[in-house]
Structures are given as C-alpha cells and as structure tokens.
C-alpha cells in the first residue's frame, strides 16, 4: 500500500508540513454494507489502527519521492459470519511529535469510503482511492480464522481424528487437508457457498441468494439496492450508472441511493448536499505550510486559505511548481529556489522577469564608425573594416585569421586585406585553381579534407537516430 | 539586498485620504505577499493589511472599510490608501514583505510618519 | 481575534543575564504559526523567530523561541548591550494578524 499526492497533484512532500517529525497511522473501518448508516455509525463489522508506524521528519522544501509506510497488515477481527457486501473506510491520521508540534496532535489527512463485495479466502483485491489531493493504494482480502472456513466463514471446521479420514459422513475441509468439516450446525441442505447459520439448524442467505437453502437466486422484483438480475436469473449484478457512480459525495462522505436519488453521509467537519460545505473553523488550524486562515470564525461561515508563495491547494497542501506558469518573459530561464523565483535572462533583457528590453546601443554609440544593429532579441556592433569587439574599439588585423588560401599572401590595408595569390590559384581569397588548358577555374577542394566515406556517413547517421 | 522604501506625505487633514507607496528594490515583487503595518506613537504595531501579486488582498477588520492595498508590478511599487482620517491615525507606516514560510514579516521599511492634523 | 498577551511590559536586567519574555494568545495557535521581533528606538522591527522556534537568518543563537497552543516564549539566554530594546510576538495563524503590546528590556 502507499499514500501520497496523486498523479499531477504536485511533488510527493513529508505529510509533516513543516511541523516538526510526525506519524502516519491508518484506521479502517468495516460497516455492514446494506446498512443506510451515517458514516460517523459504528464500525459495526470491526476497526483497527495501523501498527509498526515510521517517523517522518520534514526538512522545508525537500520533497519526499515515496513515503515509507507502516510496515505490515491491519488486521479487522470480525465476529459472526463474514456479510460479503460491506462498507470500507480507511483513514490516514498524521501525529504531531515533539514538544513543539503545536496544534491538535492528531490530524486526519485523508478519509476514503468505498462499498466492496468480497467473498472470504479469495485473493487480494487491490484499489486505488483518491480524496483531494491525496492518493491512497491498498489491497484487502477476508480471510476466515480456524476453524471457520467457506464464503462466509459461516462453516467450522475440526483437526481430524484419524490422520487418514474424516468421521463418518464428515467431508475434508478443503483449504486445510488436515481438517475435516464439523458437524453441520446449520439446515442440511444448507448452501455453503450461499448460505450460513448463527444458530443451530437456520440456514441465513448472503446477499443475492434466497430460498430456504439459499440456493435460489434472487428474482428480479427482489433484488436489492437497485441490482438488476444476471443474465438467466443466476443473481443480482450491480446496476448500470446509477447516482452514486463516481461517488458526488466529496470530502470522503459516503453515497447511499434513495429512490432513483442519492443521500450523502457527510464525516464530522463537513456538511452540504455533496458534504462540499467545510464546517472547519479557523480554530482547527486547517491552513498548513505558513497558510494563514482568513475567515471561519464559526462553523456557518466557510474559511478560506491565504498560501505563501509555492502553495497552493483548499488547505495549501499542494506545493507548486511555479516555473510551470512561464513566469519568466523573453525566454528567460526560470528557476524555483523554492523562497523564490528567479528569472536568469537571454542577452539584451533585464528586470526579475526579464521584461525589460535593454537598449544596448543607446548612449553608447559604436566607435570607429561602427552602427548598432538589432536582432534574435539583442543588439550588437556592426564594426567598420579594421575594427572589432563589442564597441568596435579594438584595431582588428585582418590578415590574423589567415583568409588567403592555397599559399596565398595576405596584406593589411585601411580598406581591409588584399590577397597575393600563389602561382596557379586566383580570386579575392585565391579560392580558384586556374587550370593549365585554359578551362573554366574551378573550385578547390579544401586542403585536409577528402571526399566522405557514404557508409561511414550512413552509419553515424543510423546511430544518430537511435 | 532587498530594500523598501515609503514615500508620501507627511501630513495629511481630517477625513482626507492617506495616501503611501512602497517602492521594492533588489527583488521580484512577484515572489511575495507584501504588507502594510503602522504603530502610533509610544504604542504598539498593528497590521492594516497585505497584498500579493495574484490580487490576493486581506486587511484588518477594524479598518477594513477604509483600507486599499494595490500594487503596480511594472513599476515594482505596492501602495495605501486609508480613507476618511482621524488623529488616531497618526502613526509611523511601514511596509513590510511577508515571509515566504507564513505571515510573519521579514524585511522591513525605515517607516514614514504620517500625522493627521489640520 | 486573537488577542496577544505580553508579560511583562518591562523587563530590567544587566547585561549577561538571562531574558525570559512570555507570550500569552486569547486561543490556542493550531500550527504555532507565531513569531518574535525586536524593535530598537527610532528603527524598524526586525524578524527573530517564526514558527515560535525557528530563527531568521542572521539572528544569534542566544535568542531562541519555545511554546505551543496558547503560551509561547522568548529567551535571551546572555543579554548582550544591543538587546536592550522592545520585543514584540505576532502569530500568523489566523486573520487578522495580531500583535502583542510588547515587552521592553531595559538596563538595570
């Protein structure tokens, strides 16, 4: 299991929220799922708190890639049979540590309710759950503990007699092959799959089934909470969109569908159709991250978070990547600091958010008879021949880049160089060969380089792709 | 260095409006929430109310009517304007930036004095 | 509002000894959202603590900051002359943000 922001809601941080080390501690709860119970009922089917809990320290600014979770299962004993369709609720609560954790020492970060069907001693059922900014992965199962065994744990088992056989008319326990099933306290006949008994000779039906065996699928008039029959009556199937599909219930208020409607169960601290109406106050300390809590004086009025800069959410929970708003203009580089922005500008732009456009040339002409020229989002010095530099006021040699090819001579004049070109060759640069028949000049292959090799290019040009 | 800097006249007549500029220097105003508090004389400090570049703005109920916060970010200048003076708004008037770790104040004007007399 | 209690209103000491200034809130203060300033004649406060114990940057290490819910404090541990002056708390958990009336440490 693991819990953290979900996909695109942020960087994974600590859950300690600059308060100091904290823990994290689930809490699931199991409620009989044809109930029409409030989610603050009982849990009638059992609870349990996570045991074995990592502390969490928070370091400001630092993210935390995966939180390491309480290690192991939550185990929930439920008495009786096992019901098959229930309710799950499963908290995440944060403790405060340390003598100055401040505020409330517990905090619950995150609630998700969902209703399951789940036959015991099958395999791992996995789910995700996500509830604000929060994303909440786990698996379940049911399993029955010995003796009981079958769907509904309903039938017992005992340790065999005999190390060979079961008693008379007694069959094998069949996921213990050292035990045999004990003598039926239920209706004969009863169903195993389908049915289980709490006192001597009833036969009670798990969701679905009827009849005094529980063998009969439910018909279609009977089938319960909107379920439609299967196909040739071999049960009830969940219905089609119905009005609790995709939950409208926010804040982890559980959905319950009441005549082609729905009714949301709100948990403690929320209210409102959906339970969208906070009924925190500013008193809870609701605003995490330095959020200052601006209204909610009383539980009617709704408080509203003032985040710091790099936060964001209802609660301020969320920390943002502000490089994603483009904040920097002229394409300036951006950089999150985390206590701030900064914008690192292209040549020719200044200001924090590089939006302002130097004028580079103004008050500073080019010397030497050099003009300003504009362009690709900066200025620049057009030199005069014989100068250089960024204001033109470096002499420039002219010759020093050796412009003159094949042997050429070069030779530095006030309107800039002249070649003397080497017997056979010709042009402003020598670049022509001048051919000895007389035929057109042509030009030479630079000294140094020969012709490419087309497969040593093709292949570069294969690797380059991959 | 970040500096802050009021300016704004310092007498002001009753029910006139007060009005001061916060000039920041050597940051982004963008990067922060920005503040105003003022302390009378011989008293102590009270915040009149904040402003953040988003147009976040939040004030002091007990002056909140008479309280603008706005802010130019081109001219990286944050301003007040306080409404229908009395001498009990005779104060020294600093602005101030929020701490980017919650609302608590980490740089700080010199202060302007501002009395309201006729 | 929370109302901010400071006590005592002045403190007189000598330099070297040890400073214990008290913040009181009307309502606990969730998420210690609270810090500390001092304020010299003529200038400007100056940011000490956040967070009821954390240190701004620059501050000595004499000053520290402890407390949560409704009672928090300051400590000088060895008054040095320039802390002869006036402190003040601030919390910043709820709005409006409030101050205390002040404390104002003064040579014996």
């Known amino acids: 299991h693991s819990f953290g922001p979900g996909p695109g809601l942020g960087t994974p941080r600590s859950p300690c929220n600059a308060r100091g080390p904290c823990r994290l501690f689930f809490r699931v709860c199991l409620k009989p799922g044809v109930s029409q119970e409030a989610t603050e009922s009982l849990c009638a089917l059992g609870a349990a708190l996570s045991t074995s809990v990592p502390v969490y320290t928070e370091h400001p600014g630092e993210s935390a890639a995966a939180l390491p979770l309480p290690d192991g299962l939550v185990r929930v004993p439920f008495r009786d049979a096992w019901p098959g369709t229930f309710s799950l609720v499963i908290e995440t609560w944060r403790e405060q540590l340390g003598e100055h954790a401040g505020g409330p020492a517990w905090n619950l970060l995150a609630r998700v309710v969902g209703r399951r069907r789940l036959a015991a001693g099958g395999p791992w059922a996995r789910d995700v759950q996500r509830t604000g900014t929060w994303e909440l992965h786990f698996s379940y199962r049911a399993r029955c503990e010995p003796p009981a065994v079958g769907a509904a744990c309903a039938r017992l088992c005992r340790s065999r007699s005999a190390p060979s056989r079961c008693g008379p008319g007694l069959r094998p326990c069949t996921p213990f092959p050292d035990e045999c099933e004990a003598p039926s306290v239920c209706r004969p006949g009863c169903s195993p799959e389908h049915g289980y008994c709490e006192e001597p000779d009833e036969c009670r039906c798990l969701e679905g089934w009827t009849g005094p065996l529980c063998t009969v699928p439910v018909s279609t008039s009977s089938c319960l909470n909107s379920r439609v029959p299967g196909p040739a009556s071999t049960g009830c199937l969940l219905p089609g969109p119905g009005p609790c599909d995709g939950n409208p219930c926010a804040n982890g208020g559980s959905c319950s569908e009441t005549s082609g409607s729905f009714e949301c169960a709100c948990p403690r601290g929320f209210y409102g159709l959906r339970c969208e109406v906070s009924g925190v106050t500013c008193a809870d300390g609701p605003c995490f991250n330095g959020g200052l809590c601006v209204g909610g004086e009383d539980p009617d009025s709704a408080y509203v978070c003032h985040c710091p800069p790099g936060f964001q959410g209802s609660n301020c929970e969320k920390r943002v990547d502000r490089c994603s708003l483009q904040p920097c203009q002229n394409g300036g580089l951006c950089l999150d600091l985390g206590h701030a922005l900064r914008c690192r500008c292209r040549a020719g732009f200044a200001g924090p958010r590089c939006e302002h456009d130097l004028d580079d040339c103004a008050g500073r002409a080019c010397a030497n008879g050099g003009t300003c020229v504009e362009g690709g989002g900066s200025r620049r010095c057009s030199c005069a021949l014989g100068f250089g530099g960024r204001d033109c006021r470096e002499r420039a040699d002219p010759c020093a880049s050796r412009p003159c090819a094949h042997g050429g001579r070069c030779y530095a004049h006030f309107s800039g160089l002249v070649c003397a070109c080497a017997p056979g060759y010709m042009g402003v640069r020598c670049e022509f060969a001048v051919r000895p028949d007389g035929a057109d000049a042509v030009p030479a292959a630079p000294r140094g380089l020969r012709q490419a090799d087309p497969q040593r290019f093709l292949h570069h040009h294969h690797h380059h792709h991959h | 260095q970040v500096q802050l800097q009021e300016s704004g006249p310092g007498l002001v007549k009753p029910s006139e409006t007060l009005s001061l500029t916060c000039t920041v220097s050597?940051?982004?105003?963008?990067?922060?929430?920005w503040t105003w508090i003022r302390q009378p004389p011989g008293k102590g400090l009270e915040w009149i109310g904040y402003i953040y570049y988003s147009g976040t703005t939040n004030s002091n109920p007990s002056l909140k009517s008479r309280v603008t916060v706005s802010l130019d970010t081109s001219k990286s200048q944050f301003s007040l304007n306080l409404s229908s003076v009395t001498a009990a708004d005779t104060a020294v008037y600093y602005c101030?930036?929020?701490?980017?770790?919650?609302?608590?104040?980490?740089?700080w004007g010199q202060g302007t004095m501002v009395t309201v007399s006729s | 509002e929370i109302v901010l209690t400071q006590s005592p209103g002045t403190l007189s000491l000598s330099p070297g000894e040890r400073a214990t200034l008290s913040c009181r809130a009307s309502?606990?203060?969730?998420?210690?959202?609270l810090a500390w300033y001092q304020q010299k004649p003529g200038q400007a406060p100056r940011l000490l603590i956040y967070?009821?114990?954390s240190r701004a940057t620059g501050i000595p290490d004499r000053f520290s900051g402890s407390g949560s819910g409704t009672d928090f404090t300051l400590t000088i541990s060895r008054l040095e002359p320039e802390d002869f002056a006036a402190y003040y708390c601030?919390?910043?958990?709820?709005?409006?943000?409030?101050f205390g009336g002040g404390t104002k440490v003064e040579i014996k």
């Open positions: 309502q606990r203060i969730s998420n210690t959202y």
């Open positions: 967070g009821a114990s």
């Open positions: 101030a930036r929020v701490f980017n770790r919650g609302f608590a104040f980490d740089i």
């Open positions: 050597g940051d982004s105003i963008s990067n922060y929430y």
């Open positions: 601030q919390q910043y958990d709820t709005s409006p943000l409030t």
